[in-house]
């Protein structure tokens, strides 16, 4: 059983925080073969086709071994390589980039609001999405509502599949997620010097299988090993399945129920009928959404990472099942990221950096559209200000399938949080619209014109009208419309049970149908074709925008070299909450024609930019403009005023360096640096670089 | 169906050497570690050495630790062991076999015998 | 001197039920996951039980295996004439970073 092999104990030098390569790797070996072993195991119990209880109960502890290996990689490296999270969050909730929602009421937690920073950081990270994918791909971008009712998503799946177990105490009520509570106290129990081998090694076996407990079991556990709230001690509920979605009653009556929408993507699914027609009928085409989703998260934890309201951006990419190429996937073949493979995985690899192109060419990527849109994911979130060091993207294991997927491979970032998911790229295959079609009669295809006509075996019920008329009355039309729909597959298995059982049984909109021989029988002929129907597989990148923006905080927080109280933001200029900031020397009256001047021109050409003409010494100011990541700044000093022509410093936040050039010029100089035209290179190149003040006056520009 | 096939064992005299081979087919071979066993005649079995799936790491039992080396040519599907200063001792039948622990294939053997 | 320690010989009548046992370490049995093989005379041993308990396909019923603590065995009920065999248990060993087998069980039906 799996209870026989928990993670394997390691060797002392496995404590230190961080140590050289080959170090680290015999830190490591042993963690990657008990992840293989455990890969192997998986796999022979399959190969076996051994009971599923027992494959996930192996598959649990493969993760449980996973997670070991990777925790243990995180650990062991550099230091330097983590951000400091709690001198980050300090510096976010100052600077107003985002802090709890209803603060002043004691706050909610998993809500937040975004403050001017946090917005205008928030609104460029959306509009580069915007121009990197919609404007690019010509990509339709739609609109829907948040409010769902409940049979789209029953049909979705999401009623029966989005829910955990939760448990609650008894006495003030505060909810806990039973898994993560088990694991913490159990983990609480195992760290206890006392606890002895046999019960340590019965405690990693609940472990291992933690995901694969029912209520039931995990009501059990919670009674064996005597669980009380973490926070007051009391007595705790037993579990029950809490689904995560937020319901609601649409309408006055309360007999329409509905959810806050859990995704987006419903919506374009619904909408693909209207959206083939938009585009002439004719596939590849892909549709978009951006805008909040809920999840009633049980008890979010971790900040911007876990919350119950999030913006997310999700493209549908309708194709041809039997046509899944991309004509641009050249364009991104010669980019080299981190794969992380589920072979990579089951046999305790790391991610490996590979060319896009060879990962589609030796099968490790399914397809050239799925390749096409994890390098342009890749390039957009690098573009964003995520590190590409700290950039993977990992393959699901068949196991961590969502209910609707058929290969899928996330984009993680690593956080001070460990490996954290920032965007999903699933291959739905035809799950979605198969469901919505089936559910609402509505046939979800697209036609393709056939190259030359075909004939084909065509295999229907021919369901007699008067005798189902006559047994099921005003459901008759019911179970014709259900009929009409069901396809060679389940009409073959449904006249298997006709021939041996003389009758079968359909389920349609929550109702039974009991079909006899004398209701139904199964009609077979040809047919000649000139179109052929195809149901669209989907190709899913689904980003969450707080996720990302939260790890763009983390990728581009720095301390300034030798000022431990100076941090600032590197924040791509593209993104960047301001792209410059104006700054007077002085306060003197003659420096404001300057100012006024310069900030309508930046505001002609587009440019967001921050004024701060306080009295602070201007290295103070540009500390303060630092902080909240505005790239660039124009300082007017005194030569500004004094000379002609009338020039200015423009500095680069992340070098410090700055150069000087005419006031006219500037405007469009911050503006191509802002759209990414030019570089600060390029800049330094054209223009004299600025190292004093030249006019003798005591406040000078250095830092 | 998975098959394994060892070759190149021999009569090799004390202190030479000798290179065996094990072709692997009926599987994807660069998914799975491998490893070697032998059985001297007469007694019990005796893990030798194993190999991980992209080369990154062996593992030699204390007896043949070196003196013998693991290898794996994937794009073969190959696996091969160098044994170097053969004592009488190594004397046994060698057998490849699938995984570092399962052992759920294995080859039918090729007999090393080491004597002057 | 092997590292895991099972019976050289048993022996059973046909029908009957008869039980191998063997003992390890923590830092193997204890650990890691028991497997057993089963040898006819003169061909490759074969893997008869992994993981413990789980049988490959084509393995009778007849053979099981279990495990506690640092011991493991292995049961075969309704013994016949074609079990007559050598019969090995192995593991994994953390500390040795190597396989260990018990020095084999002969089995005799009488």
């Known amino acids: 059983s799996a209870a026989s092999c928990p993670p394997i104990s390691l060797p002392a030098a496995a404590s230190r925080s961080s140590m050289d390569g080959a170090g680290a790797e015999e830190v490591l070996a042993p963690l990657r073969l008990a992840v293989r072993q455990q890969g192997d195991l998986v796999r022979k119990l399959k190969e076996d086709k051994a009971p599923q209880v027992d494959v996930d109960k192996a598959v649990a502890e493969l993760k449980a071994r996973k997670r070991v290996l990777e925790a243990k990689e995180l650990a062991l490296q550099p230091k330097d390589d983590i951000v400091d999270r709690a001198k980050m969050e300090d510096t976010l909730k100052r600077r107003f980039f985002y802090d709890q929602a209803f603060a002043i009421y004691g706050g909610v937690s998993g809500l937040y609001d975004f403050g001017p920073v946090g917005c205008a950081l928030k609104n460029n990270i959306i509009q580069t999405w915007r121009q990197h994918f919609i404007q690019e791909e010509q990509i339709l971008e739609i609109d829907c509502t948040m409010l769902t009712p409940e049979p789209v998503l029953k049909t979705s799946g999401h009623v029966d599949k989005f829910a955990d177990f939760m448990v609650k105490d008894v006495k003030n009520g505060e909810c806990f997620r039973a898994d993560h509570l088990l694991k913490a106290h159990l983990q609480k129990l195992m760290s206890d010097k006392k606890c002895s081998v046999e019960k340590k090694s019965e405690m990693e076996s609940v472990l291992a299988q933690l995901d694969n407990y029912g209520q039931q079991e995990l009501a059990d556990l919670f009674v064996n090993y005597n669980v009380k709230s973490p926070i007051t001690g009391n007595d705790l509920s037993p579990p029950v399945s809490f689904n995560l979605m937020f319901k609601t009653f649409i309408g006055p009556g309360g007999n329409m129920p509905g959810y806050l929408r859990p995704e987006t993507a419903q919506g374009i699914f619904l909408n693909f009928k209207r959206l083939l027609e938009f585009n002439q009928g004719k596939l590849p085409f892909a549709a978009a959404q951006i805008g909040n989703s809920f999840r009633n998260e049980i008890s979010p934890r971790s900040g911007l990472i876990r919350v119950r309201e999030f913006t997310m951006a999700e493209i549908e990419h309708f194709v041809d099942p039997s046509e899944k190429d991309h004509p641009k996937f050249q364009n991104v073949a010669d980019l080299h990221l981190y794969l992380y493979s589920a072979k990579a995985q089951v046999s305790g690899q790391s991610a490996r950096k590979m060319r896009l192109g060879d990962a589609v060419e030796q099968g490790v990527i399914n397809n050239t559209v799925l390749g096409y849109f994890i390098g342009r994911i890749y390039l957009y979130l690098t573009k964003v200000g995520i590190s590409p060091d700290k950039l993977r993207f990992r393959q699901h294991m068949e196991n961590e399938m969502a209910h609707y997927a058929c290969d899928c491979w996330d984009a993680e970032s690593k956080t001070s949080y460990g490996w954290i998911e920032i965007v999903g790229c699933a291959d739905r295959s035809c799950y979605d619209l198969s469901c919505h079609a089936r559910a609402t009669k509505v046939p979800l295809v697209a036609e393709k014109p056939l190259k030359e006509p075909k004939t084909v075996n065509v295999v229907q019920f021919e369901p007699s009208k008067g005798a189902i008329g006559k047994a099921y009355k005003k459901d008759a039309k019911l179970v014709m419309e259900y009929l009409a729909i069901c396809d060679e597959c389940y009409i073959t298995e449904m006249e298997m049970l006709l021939n041996e059982k003389g009758e079968f049984t359909i389920e349609t909109e929550g109702k039974t149908f009991q079909l006899t021989k004398d209701m139904i029988n199964v009609k077979r002929f040809q047919k000649t074709l000139y179109v052929e129907e195809v149901v669209p597989n989907v190709i899913e990148p689904s980003f969450g925008l707080g996720r990302i923006m939260y790890t763009v905080f983390e990728h581009t927080f720095h301390v300034r070299e030798g000022d431990e109280q100076r941090t600032f933001f590197s924040f791509p200029a593209v993104v960047a909450p301001f792209k410059c900031s104006v700054l007077p020397l002085s306060q003197n009256q003659e420096f404001m024609p300057f100012v006024k001047e310069l900030s309508e021109a930046l505001t002609r050409h587009g440019v967001s930019h921050k004024v701060d003409d306080s009295s602070g010494s201007i290295g103070r100011r540009y500390a303060r403009t630092d902080e909240i990541g505005v790239a660039f700044g124009v300082t007017i000093d005194f030569d500004t005023v004094n000379k002609t022509p009338h020039t200015a410093t423009l500095r680069d936040r992340d070098s410090m360096r700055q150069i000087r050039a005419e006031i006219s010029e500037l405007p469009s100089i911050v503006q191509d640096l802002a759209n990414g035209n030019i570089t600060w290179a390029d800049v330094e190149a054209r223009y004299p670089l600025f190292e004093g003040q030249e006019t003798g006056k005591k406040e000078t520009i250095e830092e | 169906e998975v098959q394994l096939l060892e070759s190149g064992g021999g009569l090799v005299q004390p202190g030479g050497s000798l290179r065996l081979s094990c072709a692997a087919s009926g599987f994807t071979f660069s998914d799975y570690d491998m490893s070697w066993v032998r059985q001297a005649p007469g007694k019990g079995l005796e893990w030798v050495s194993a190999?991980?799936?992209?080369?990154?790491?062996?593992y030699y039992a204390d007896s043949v630790k070196g003196r013998f080396t693991i290898s794996r040519d994937n794009s073969k599907n190959t696996l091969y062991l160098q044994m170097n200063s053969l004592r009488a001792e190594d004397t046994a039948v060698y057998y490849c076999?699938?995984?570092?622990?399962?052992?759920?294939?294995w080859g039918q053997g090729t007999l090393v015998t080491v004597s002057s | 001197q092997s590292v895991l320690t099972q019976p050289p010989s048993a022996s059973g009548t046909p029908g009957q039920r008869v039980t191998i046992s063997c003992t390890g370490s923590s830092s193997n049995i204890g650990n890691n996951y028991v497997n057993w093989y089963q040898q006819l005379p003169g061909t490759a041993p074969k893997l008869l039980i992994y993981?413990?308990?789980h049988r490959p396909s084509g393995v009778p019923d007849r053979f099981s295996g279990s495990k506690s603590g640092t011991s493991a065995s292995l049961a075969i009920s309704g013994l016949r004439s074609e079990d007559e065999a050598d019969y090995y248990c192995?593991?994994?060993?953390?500390?040795?970073?190597?396989?260990?087998f018990g020095g084999g069980t002969k089995l005799t039906v009488l």
């Open positions: 993981a413990d308990s």
């Open positions: 190999i991980s799936p992209d080369d990154g790491s062996k």
């Open positions: 192995g593991a994994w060993d953390s500390s040795l970073s190597g396989y260990v």
């Open positions: 076999a699938r995984t570092t622990w399962l052992f759920d294939y």
